[in-house]
């Protein structure tokens, strides 16, 4: 059995960012499981004093696109589109620095999901990064267009 599937997003937790677009899942049953865990994580985030407004504005859509990545339509095999590395780094090192430290020491917040590792993402100018998912972090836009 091949691994990796493209299927329409059927959830609620990330619907405002993803709609019903086609997302990549490693296995057929994974979407429901991750949906439950993202819902639980968002509930915990909503009641947490650990999350600043400047972080949550971009961390929540970023987490949705990480958990339910769009399928790469240019690929002949099912393949996820990645987050953009420059935005990932600004999120981790600037906007959400404190929150990332907290999340790293409390991995059960995300349950089945690993925290995004920016080092896993292709360098911004590489061909592999051309199709990355851009959240729209203002500082990253500036960084992206002027470097």
């Amino acid at each position: 059995e091949e691994d990796g599937f493209c299927q329409p997003y059927r959830g609620i937790a990330c619907a405002r960012f993803i709609g019903n677009r086609t997302v990549y899942m490693e296995s057929l049953h994974m979407q429901g499981e991750i949906e439950n865990q993202i819902t639980a994580a968002f509930t915990m985030i909503g009641t947490s004093s650990h999350l600043s407004d400047k972080c949550s504005q971009f961390a929540i859509p970023s987490l949705c696109h990480y958990a339910f990545p769009y399928c790469d339509e240019t690929s002949s095999v099912p393949k996820p589109r990645d987050l953009c590395r420059d935005e990932c780094e600004i999120l981790e090192n600037v906007l959400c620095q404190t929150e990332y430290i907290f999340a790293r020491s409390n991995p059960m917040i995300l349950m089945r999901l690993k925290l995004p590792n920016c080092e896993d993402l292709p360098q911004p100018e590489s061909p592999e990064a051309a199709n990355c998912i851009r959240i729209g972090i203002p500082m990253a836009d500036h960084h992206h267009h002027h470097h």
Partner: antibody
Framework: EVQLVESGGGLVQPGGSLRLSCAAS????????IHWVRQAPGKGLEWVGY????????YYADSVKGRFTISADTSKNTAYLQMNSLRAEDTAVYYC?????????????WGQGTLVTVSS | QTVVTQEPSLTVSPGGTVTLTCGSS?????????PNWFQQKPGQAPRGLIG???FLAPGTPARFSGSLLGGKAALTLSGVQPEDEAEYYC?????????FGGGTQLTVTG
């Protein structure tokens, strides 16, 4: 079907070099980490290192750092372990295994292993 | 040098329950170490059983369960079957490197 197949093992003299390959099929390696794990005859498992083929980021065990290099060719869906300055204690069966970049799960698929013997 | 410790060997009767543990020389094992458990039978490649303390890999029987117990990671087998006789390894994550334990030889007798 998901499969990992190692090749390139054999007999090599101390100080010599060898390159192992790990050919993946049934999945795209860019969505995963590819680990190398070795097992000396009659001994336990030892983690060697891993690569994130998507970015080329690599991490190594202290015992092999500076001598071993992990790389990947995403167009061939294959990872490699380049072993230089080989020592007798590097004699082992070398396995490659995959690990999800996104999800918490154990290394879920392993190759059958390839034997590397370092001896004069 | 970080050391991950396991019981060298354990014996259990068929149908019984046994718990294997995995400790770290750096202190208490937490979920942040993402404890992994693997099974290896003679002449075979290892097989992933559990990741992230408690998440079963597809195909892992429900009689296997993972937890944290007294500052260690634990693998519990309930209703042990003869085919569970094998070497069991744990592995812990230390920010960008994995360290395997020495393994526990589980013998099923009876």
């Amino acid at each position: 079907e998901v499969q990992l197949v190692e090749s390139g093992g054999g007999l090599v003299q101390p100080g010599g070099s060898l390159r192992l390959s790990c050919a993946a099929s049934g999945f795209n390696i860019t969505g995963y980490y590819i680990h190398w794990v070795r097992q000396a005859p009659g001994k336990g498992l030892e983690w060697v290192g891993y690569i994130s083929p998507n970015s080329g980021s690599t991490y190594y065990a202290d015992s092999v750092k500076g001598r071993f290099t992990i790389s990947a060719d995403t167009s061939k869906n294959t990872a490699y372990l380049q072993m230089n300055s080989l020592r007798a204690e590097d004699t082992a069966v070398y396995y490659c295994a995959r690990d999800s970049r996104r999800y918490v799960r154990p290394f879920d698929y392993w190759g059958q292993g390839t034997l590397v013997t370092v001896s004069s | 040098q970080t050391v991950v410790t396991q019981e060298p060997s354990l014996t259990v009767s068929p149908g019984g329950t046994v718990t294997l543990t995995c400790g770290s020389s750096t202190g208490a094992v937490t979920s942040g170490y993402y404890p992994n458990w693997f099974q290896q039978k003679p002449g075979q490649a290892p097989r992933g059983l559990i990741g992230g303390t408690k998440f079963l890999a597809p195909g892992t029987p429900a009689r296997f369960s993972g937890s944290l117990l007294g500052g260690k990671a634990a693998l519990t087998l309930s209703g042990v079957q003869p085919e569970d006789e094998a070497e069991y390894y744990c592995a812990l994550w230390y920010s960008n490197r994995w360290v395997f334990g020495g393994g526990t030889q589980l013998t099923v007798t009876g």
